[in-house]
């Protein structure tokens, strides 16, 4: 009789992570009599997969029932694949002996090989808001891709970037791959409103990329202008001096009056208007008795923005001359009870 | 359900002998092996051997070689350990252990005293 | 025969403490081949952990094992009361199977 061979006739099985892979082997004989195992790898290191006889084996069935008695399909399944399951499947048959069964015949192997999606990917952008002009840096990272072959773009508001660049690591043979990518982005004033994307594209995806992002407005600092003006207002012994806070982003900002610096009154920025680009606009102003006074007063309009060293705006108003002469025509708006007379 | 259930225990003198039973149920019985696994009060586990339901095929610890028999009755799905010459070593708890070693009988309790 | 020898025999935790207890094996063992089972008082042992390093259904994922050779562990992250149990290495690589003399876990 011809001697027992073990047939593995797939070359090599190609599964999703998470589907079951099946992995086939016949043998052409009973004889000898023994138990066919299956191996992943090969030599003394090999990992042992399947024992029909003993030992736990929870993710893997046989295709039929082992126990028959002239059973000579020996073909599994393997459940809820991973990347970590890539690699090559023997399947071997033993002859009975004592102590230990001995290896009698092998297959010639099935190259399992898994396809997994990457992990959405996460954008992060620098741990300090910057300011306009600047330039910051962006991170994309997607993980758990198996081929290795993959591709990745960046966009902002839609626009392809061009100065970045990306690591697939490992970069030799791993059971799955994971890509990190650093872009850098030059902020300018408008971009409170902007997004940074990051785009992914791998086989397991069918040409749907995923895509992670990033709004500027989580990076940018966009500090304010300020202008400081006077116009006579009520009585002829009172002035409204204006302070209006411009074009700022966030929102977090402090204002603070000095006469003469003496601090007069400290707010913050409250009811605040909103410009199409997404920046903000704030005014404060402050009734000013000019009768009180002999000399001049110095007001300064100071503001704290977002934590950082304050920007300040000074007006000399002239106590010798009238009130009415002196006015500026920038007209003020009313943005809130923010009066307050100096005695 | 998966259940090995094994004989009650069992009070016998030295010298004499005894078989323990292991009826299994839930499973194919000649799917694996069905081993025997010694525990003495207080102390570790140790093999004592195994049997293939499928062919009757058997192996043994050496140390238990001349005091241990395992057998089946396939038409009942039932493993059996056979101990001989029993002497006060031999108390102990008896776990009869499908080949998983996921699945063991709940144990039966051999005391040998005069 | 492989003998395996567990250390230590014996070993006391306080709750919430990280535990490891060591197997280790008189001649290599393929990982395939390393299984580790709880016991406690008056039960049937369980499987605990296959294959060196994964957990049998329903164990709590705090345990965990690993190694390689003749050195294999069994750790817990942090140990809980429920814990407290004897915990036996076992080989099949090769006959005669073989069994650790365990570790008994006591809970302060």
């Known amino acids: 009789e011809e001697e027992l061979q073990v047939i593995q006739p797939d070359k090599s099985v190609l599964v999703a992570a998470g589907e079951t892979a099946t992995l086939r082997c016949t043998a052409t004989s009973l004889i000898p009599v023994g138990p066919i195992q299956w191996f992943r790898g090969a030599g003394p290191g090999r990992e042992l997969i399947y024992n029909q006889k003993e030992g736990h084996f929870p993710r893997v069935t046989t295709v039929s029932d082992l126990t028959k008695r002239n059973n000579m399909d020996f073909s599994i399944r393997i459940g809820n694949i991973t990347p970590a399951d890539a690699g090559t499947y023997y399947c071997v048959k033993f002859r009975k002996g004592s102590p230990d069964d001995v290896e009698f015949k092998s297959g010639a192997g099935t190259e399992l090989s898994v396809r997994a999606k990457p992990s959405a990917p996460v954008v992060s952008g620098p741990a300090a808001r910057a300011t306009p002009q600047h330039t910051v840096s962006f991170t994309c990272e997607s993980h758990g891709f198996s081929p290795r072959d993959i591709t990745l773009k960046w966009f902002k508001n839609g626009n392809e970037l061009s100065d970045f660049q990306t690591n697939v690591d490992p970069v030799g043979e791993s059971v799955s791959y994971s890509i990190h990518s650093t872009a850098k982005v030059v902020l300018t004033r408008e971009d409170v409103h902007s997004q940074v994307i990051c785009e992914v594209a791998h086989v397991t995806l069918q040409g749907d990329p995923l895509r992670g992002t990033a709004n500027l407005s989580e990076t940018i600092r966009v500090p304010p202008t300020l202008e400081v003006t006077q116009q006579p207002v009520r009585a002829e012994n009172q002035v409204n001096v204006t302070c209006q806070v411009r074009k700022f982003y966030p929102q977090r900002l402090q204002l603070t009056w000095l006469e003469n610096g003496n601090v007069s009154r400290t707010e913050t920025a409250s009811t605040v208007t909103e410009n199409k680009d997404g920046t903000y606009n704030w005014m404060s102003w402050l009734l000013v008795n000019v009768s009180a006074h002999r000399d001049d007063v110095k007001l300064t309009c100071q503001v704290e923005h977002d934590g950082q060293p304050a920007v300040s705006k000074s007006h000399d108003l002239k106590v010798s001359a009238h009130p009415k002469e002196q006015g500026s025509n920038t007209a003020a708006e009313n943005t809130g009870s923010n009066e307050r007379n100096i005695y | 359900e998966v259940q090995l259930q094994q004989s009650g225990a069992e009070l016998v003198k030295p010298g004499a002998s005894v078989k323990l039973s292991c009826t299994a149920s839930?499973?194919?019985?000649?799917?694996?092996?069905i081993h025997w696994v010694k525990q003495r009060p207080d102390q570790g586990l140790e093999w004592i051997g195994r049997?293939?339901?499928?062919?009757?095929?058997?192996k043994h610890n050496p140390k238990f070689h001349d005091k241990a028999t395992v057998t089946v009755d396939t038409s009942s799905n039932t493993a059996y350990l056979e101990l001989s010459s029993l002497t006060s070593e031999d108390t102990a708890v008896y776990y009869c252990?499908?080949?998983?070693?996921?699945?063991w009988g709940q144990g039966t309790t051999l005391t040998v005293s005069s | 025969q492989i003998v395996l020898i567990q250390s230590p025999a014996i070993m006391s935790a306080s709750p919430g403490e990280r535990v490891t207890l060591t197997c280790r094996a008189s001649?290599?063992?393929?990982?395939?081949?390393l299984y580790w089972y709880q016991q406690k008082p008056g039960s049937s042992p369980k499987l605990w952990i296959y294959?060196?390093?994964n957990l049998a259904s329903g164990v709590p994922a705090r345990f965990s094992g690993s190694g390689s050779g003749t050195s294999y562990s069994l750790t817990i992250s942090s140990v809980e009361a429920e814990d407290a149990a004897s915990y036996f290495c076992?080989?099949?690589?090769?006959?005669?199977?073989?069994f650790g003399g365990g570790t008994k876990l006591e809970i302060k």
């Open positions: 294959s060196a390093s």
């Open positions: 049997i293939d339901p499928a062919d009757g095929d058997t």
């Open positions: 076992h080989q099949w690589y090769s006959y005669p199977r073989t």
């Open positions: 839930g499973f194919n019985f000649e799917d694996t092996y």
């Open positions: 252990v499908r080949g998983n070693y996921v699945n």
């Open positions: 001649s290599s063992v393929t990982s395939s081949y």
